[in-house]
C-alpha cells in the first residue's frame, strides 16, 4: 500500500472553462501562503549522555526539527562527516538500521529522532571529549548536521543539554532550490494580495465539464509522471575520514543532484503507528559518498518507522549498486 502525502497541486484550467483564471488567482495565494507559513529553517539537535553505570558508555540522541520527511540519518564520531568523522550508524526509516563498532544499539525513538548506545570497552570506545555528529537527510530541506559532546566537567549520569545545530550544513541542491521557490512564491503572493485589494474578484462561472474543476487537488503521481521526473531521495553528500571512505559510484556515480523531487513523502505517526507492509525490490540504487545507498524498486513500499519510497520506473536493477555502509 502506498502512502503519499496529499500535497495541493494546481490543476491547469480545462479547455473552455470560464472564469478559470479568476479561480486560479484565488487558489494560488492560499497554496503559496501555506508554503510561506510552513517554510522554517530546520534544525538538528544532539544530546550526549555518559551512563552512570559504565563510565565509558555513551548514549547519543539526535533529532530533526523540520517539516520535511527524513530519508536517512548518519551518526558519526570524531567530528562531522566531512571532517574526519567515522560512521557509527546509518538509520533508514524503511530499509533498516546499520551500526558499526563500537555502536551497540541504534534505534528510531520517534519519526524524527534517533538514539544510539556506544559500548564502553575496547580500543575503539569513546572518551569524554569525543564529538558526536548526526546528519539528517530530509526532503525537501536537504542534508543537515549537528555535533555535540559532553561538557568537560560532566558528572556520569548527566547529559549535555541538546546542542541545536552548531554545525548546520545544508545541501545546496535541496536548500537553495526550495528556498528560492518559496521566496519567489512569497513575493508573488504579496504581489497578488496587493493586486487583489485594488480590483474586485472575478465572478466564477460553473464549469460545463466538471463541477469541481479547476481546484487544488491531491497529487498522486502517475507512472508516467514518475518516469519523467524520478528523483532518488537520500541526498547525503559528505564523507567520512578519507582514509576509510566508504564510497561507491555505480554506473558513473550520482548524476542526479540537480533533479527536482516529484513526490511528497508522508510523515509517519510515530512508532506506534508505523505500519509493516511489503518492501521494495533490490535494485535502482543511488550512490552517496559515505557508501550509503537509497534504494527503490518495483515492490510496494515498506513503511517501517517511515516514509514513502520513490520507485525507479525503470524497474529493479536499473541502477544496481550496493550499500557501502549497510
Amino acid at each position: 500500500m502506498r502512502t503519499e502525502a496529499q500535497v495541493p497541486a494546481l490543476q491547469p484550467p480545462e479547455p473552455g472553462l470560464e472564469g478559470a483564471m479568476g479561480h486560479r488567482t484565488l487558489v494560488l495565494p492560499w497554496v503559496l501562503l501555506t508554503l510561506c507559513v510552513t517554510a522554517g529553517t530546520p534544525e538538528v539537535w544532539v544530546q550526549v549522555r555518559m551512563e552512570a553505570t559504565e563510565l565509558s558508555s555513551f548514549t547519543i540522541r539526535c533529532g530533526f526539527l523540520g517539516s520535511g520527511s527524513i530519508s536517512l540519518v548518519t551518526v558519526s564520531w570524531g567530528g562531522p562527516n566531512g571532517a574526519g568523522g567515522t560512521t557509527l550508524a546509518v538509520l533508514h526509516p524503511e530499509r533498516g538500521i546499520r551500526q558499526w563498532a563500537p555502536a551497540r544499539q541504534a534505534r528510531w525513538e520517534t519519526q524524527s529522532s534517533i538514539s544510539l548506545i556506544l559500548e564502553g570497552s575496547g580500543a575503539s570506545s569513546p572518551c569524554a571529549n569525543t564529538t558526536f555528529c548526526c546528519k539528517f537527510a530530509s526532503f525537501p530541506e536537504g542534508s543537515w548536521e549537528a555535533c555535540g559532546s559532553l561538557p568537560p566537567s560532566s558528572d556520569p549520569g548527566l547529559s549535555a543539554p541538546p546542542t541545536p545545530a552548531p554545525i548546520l550544513r545544508a545541501d545546496l541542491a535541496g536548500i537553495l532550490g526550495v528556498s528560492g521557490v518559496l521566496l519567489f512564491g512569497c513575493v508573488y503572493l504579496l504581489h497578488l494580495l496587493r493586486r487583489h485589494k485594488h480590483r474586485p474578484a472575478p465572478r466564477l462561472q460553473p464549469s460545463r465539464t466538471s463541477p469541481q474543476a479547476p481546484r487544488a487537488r491531491a497529487w498522486a503521481p502517475s507512472q508516467a509522471s514518475q518516469a519523467a521526473l524520478h528523483v532518488p531521495y537520500a541526498t547525503i553528500n559528505t564523507s567520512c575520514r578519507p582514509a576509510t571512505l566508504d564510497t561507491a559510484h555505480p554506473h558513473g556515480g550520482p548524476s542526479w543532484w540537480a533533479s527536482l523531487p516529484t513526490h511528497a513523502a508522508h510523515r509517519p505517526q510515530g512508532p506506534a503507528a508505523w505500519a509493516s507492509t511489503p518492501i521494495p525490490a533490490r535494485g535502482s540504487f543511488v550512490s552517496v559518498e559515505n557508501g550509503l545507498y537509497a534504494q527503490a524498486g518495483e515492490r510496494p513500499p515498506h513503511t517501517g518507522p517511515g516514509l514513502t519510497l520513490f520507485p525507479d520506473p525503470r524497474g529493479p536493477r536499473a541502477m544496481e549498486g550496493p550499500l557501502g555502509v549497510r
Epitope: T86, T87, H92, E94, R95, G96, I97, R98, Q99, W100, A101, A106, R107, C240, R241, A243, T244, L245, D246, T247, A248, P250, P271, W274, S276, T277, P278, I279, P280, R282, F285, G291, Y293, Q295, R299, H302, G304, P305, G306, G321, P322, L323, G324, V325, R326
Partner: antibody, heavy 118, light 107 residues
Framework: EVKLVESGGGLVQPGGSLKLSCVAS????????MSWVRQTPEKRLELVAD????????YYSDTVKGRFTISRDNAKNTLYLQMSSLKSEDTAMYYC???????????WGQGTLVTVSA | DIQMTQSSSSFSVSLGDRVTITCKAS??????LAWYQQKPGNAPRLLIS???SLETGVPSRFSGSGSGKNYTLSITSLQTEDVGTYYC?????????FGGGTNLEIK
Amino acid sequence: EVKLVESGGGLVQPGGSLKLSCVASGFTFNTYIMSWVRQTPEKRLELVADISNSGGNTYYSDTVKGRFTISRDNAKNTLYLQMSSLKSEDTAMYYCARPDNWDPFVYWGQGTLVTVSA
Amino acid sequence: DIQMTQSSSSFSVSLGDRVTITCKASEDIYARLAWYQQKPGNAPRLLISGATSLETGVPSRFSGSGSGKNYTLSITSLQTEDVGTYYCQQHWSTPWTFGGGTNLEIK
C-alpha cells in the same frame, strides 16, 4: 554470475589460528559489504563478522570479538577472516556471504569447514 | 540484539500438504524478514525477503506473511524438493539474526 569461493578451513587445535579466504567474482567487489556467516554442528546460523565496502567499518559478534579479524583486499576481490585463540565452540561451516544492500544474504559461497579439536 | 524464535524445530509432513512455519521476533522488525531454505550439504538459499517478496526463481507455492513481531512461511502443496531446513532472519537492525531453523521431513 556471482560466485563466492571459500578456502582455508581445516582441523586446528584449541588456541590455534586459521585464516579463511573468500574469492569473489561476477560483481564489483569493492562496492559491497561482505559478511562471514557460520553454521554450527547443531545447524544454527550466526553472523560472525562483516565489513564495509572499503574496509573502514567492521562488525563482530560478541562470541568472536577480539579473537577474529575480518579484512578485505579489493584489488584481489578477496575477503578474509583471521581466526585466533580458537575454541571448540568455533567449530562450524564458515560461509562467505554477500547481502544486497539493505536486503538479506542473496549470495553465499559453498562454505569451508573449520574443526577445532584437540 | 533482536532474537528470532522458530517454535517448531521439526515437522513431519506428507507430500501435497499445506505447511506453515512460524517465526517470532523479540521486537518489531517492520516486515524486514527473510526466509531461507537449506538442503543437506548446501548453503542456505534465499526464498523471501521483506516478509512477502519472493525471490526470482522461487516457486509460487511459497508465500510469506506477517507484520510486527510475527511472521509465517507457507507452502501450499509440499513437493519432494521442498524437504530441508527453513530459517527466518531479520534484516531490520544489525546484527542480522537468524531463527533456529525448522526441519521439514516426509512422513
